[in-house]
């Protein structure tokens, strides 16, 4: 609603504020086709959208940043939308000794906030 | 040098890429004058500057983001400059039961990276 806390309600309209979005990417897109075998295509969740004042503030620093951006927009940038957590994903890749499965903890975003 | 690893060398020129910068802020600037007593003025280190391709990438996700931004700039945003670590700071503030010292772990940035 219009009266929701600014942390949770996007004043810019649906889908405009910081959120998680799925981006399809092939191994070729990532430049990984020479060392990753599977999967051939990744569903990469990424953080996109704007960070209006106090929306999904990551912490106290982000709240301060938002406020100072309002006062000195030329000097202090607005907070921006970045991952708050990640979903681990397993890739099959080539190694010197053959093929192995490797878990990557920081590859796919699971949640987003404004930092 | 021109051949330095992109993580460490700013291709945009001195001071243009993601770095730590000190911003002076009063309690009034922060809207804290009614509950914080000291310090009257804070030296707030903040992360500012651009994140060109692979510059100070926070992790694998940020490297992917940089690459996909190059391929789909309208769909995937460039990585942005955010704190990688914080310096704890103590504030003296009012509480319901009086005045006390409180440590804030996430108020002043200590380092920056591109996420």
């Amino acid at each position: 609603s219009a009266h929701a806390h600014p942390r949770d309600s996007c004043p810019l309209g649906p889908g405009r504020c910081c959120h998680l979005e799925t981006v399809q990417a092939t191994l070729e897109d990532l430049g990984w086709s020479d060392w990753v075998l599977s999967p051939r295509q990744l569903q990469l969740s990424m953080c996109v959208g704007e960070c209006p004042h106090l929306y999904r503030s990551a912490n106290t620093h982000a709240q301060i940043k938002a406020r100072l951006h309002g006062l000195q927009p030329d000097k202090v940038p607005a907070p921006c939308c970045v991952p708050s957590s990640y979903t681990p994903v397993v890739l099959m890749h080539r190694t010197d000794s053959g093929v192995s499965l490797q878990t990557y903890d920081d590859l796919v975003a699971r949640g987003c906030h404004c930092a | 040098s021109a051949h330095a690893h992109p993580r460490d060398s700013c291709p945009l020129g001195p001071g243009r890429c993601c770095h730590l910068e000190t911003v002076q802020a009063t309690l009034e600037d922060l809207g804290w004058s009614d509950w914080v007593l000291s310090p009257r003025q804070l030296q707030l280190s903040m992360c500012v500057g651009e994140c060109p391709h692979l510059y100070r990438s926070a992790n694998t996700h940020a490297q992917i983001k940089a690459r996909l931004h190059g391929l789909q700039p309208d769909k995937v945003p460039a990585p942005c400059c955010v704190p990688s670590s914080y310096t704890p700071v103590v504030l003296m503030h009012r509480t319901d039961s009086g005045v006390s010292l409180q440590t804030y772990d996430d108020l002043v940035a200590r380092g920056c990276h591109c996420a």
Partner: antibody, heavy 118, light 107 residues
């Protein structure tokens, strides 16, 4: 909440060097703005501030004792130290350490007693 | 050095009384004054910071006031547990200095 505890030799002879340790928990001297002071109190008398060390290693001393005092810290071990050279019977007192920020000295140790006697 | 003077070194009062302890600085200390309570066992507690700000957790019967060079600590309703020695301390400039203390006793 901060907790501080002083330790020292208990008894010294005149001209010896006093080494005191303040071990603390519940806060850190890596925190911007934080500091620790040493204060002493001869039996039945008032309090006397001796020295202060800040998080950034800035140090302050009581001018009349400055030549005899050295304050230092080990941030990683949560300890602050005070050395007093050439002790005399006038240095017989209870020595306290206390945490402080912005002049607010909010938590004190229980004190450690020193007797200087030949 | 700034001299801090507590003219009353000891004070006798009855339980329930309103007690005022005074402290004078040798120069203007701009409200940079703390009040401490020291119990007979040596335990020291901060009561008041910046002349009038009650430290968190201190009973509201304690209050501080003053400005310039003259300051006071008031206990509005004296309780048995308030039997102690009270010290003022300036932190306007180094070296920080304390008053000589006021010992509070029960009549």
């Amino acid at each position: 909440q901060g907790t501080l505890k002083e330790s020292g030799p208990g008894i010294l002879q005149p001209s010896q060097t006093l080494s005191l340790t303040c071990s603390f928990s519940g806060f850190s001297l890596s925190i911007s703005g934080m500091g620790v002071s040493w204060i002493r109190q001869p039996s039945g008398k008032g309090l006397e501030w001796l020295a202060h060390i800040y998080w950034d290693d800035d140090k302050r001393y009581k001018p009349s004792l400055k030549s005899r005092l050295t304050i230092s810290k080990d941030t990683s071990r949560n300890q602050v130290f005070l050395k007093i050279t050439s002790v005399d019977t006038a240095d017989t007192a209870t020595y306290y350490c206390a945490r402080s920020a912005y002049g607010m000295t909010d938590y004190w140790g229980q004190g450690t007693t020193l007797t200087v006697s030949s | 050095d700034i001299q801090m003077t507590q003219t009353t070194s000891s004070l006798s009062a009855s339980l329930g009384d309103r007690v005022t302890i005074s402290c004078r600085a040798s120069q203007d200390i701009s409200n940079y004054l703390n009040w401490y309570q020291q119990k007979p066992d040596g335990t020291v507690k901060l009561l008041i910071h910046s002349a009038s700000n009650l430290h968190s957790g201190v009973p509201s019967r304690f209050s501080g006031s003053g400005s310039g060079t003259d300051y006071s600590l008031t206990i509005s309703n004296l309780e048995q547990e308030d039997i102690a020695t009270y010290f003022c301390q300036q932190y306007n400039m180094f070296p920080w200095t304390f008053g000589g203390g006021t010992k509070l006793e029960i009549k």
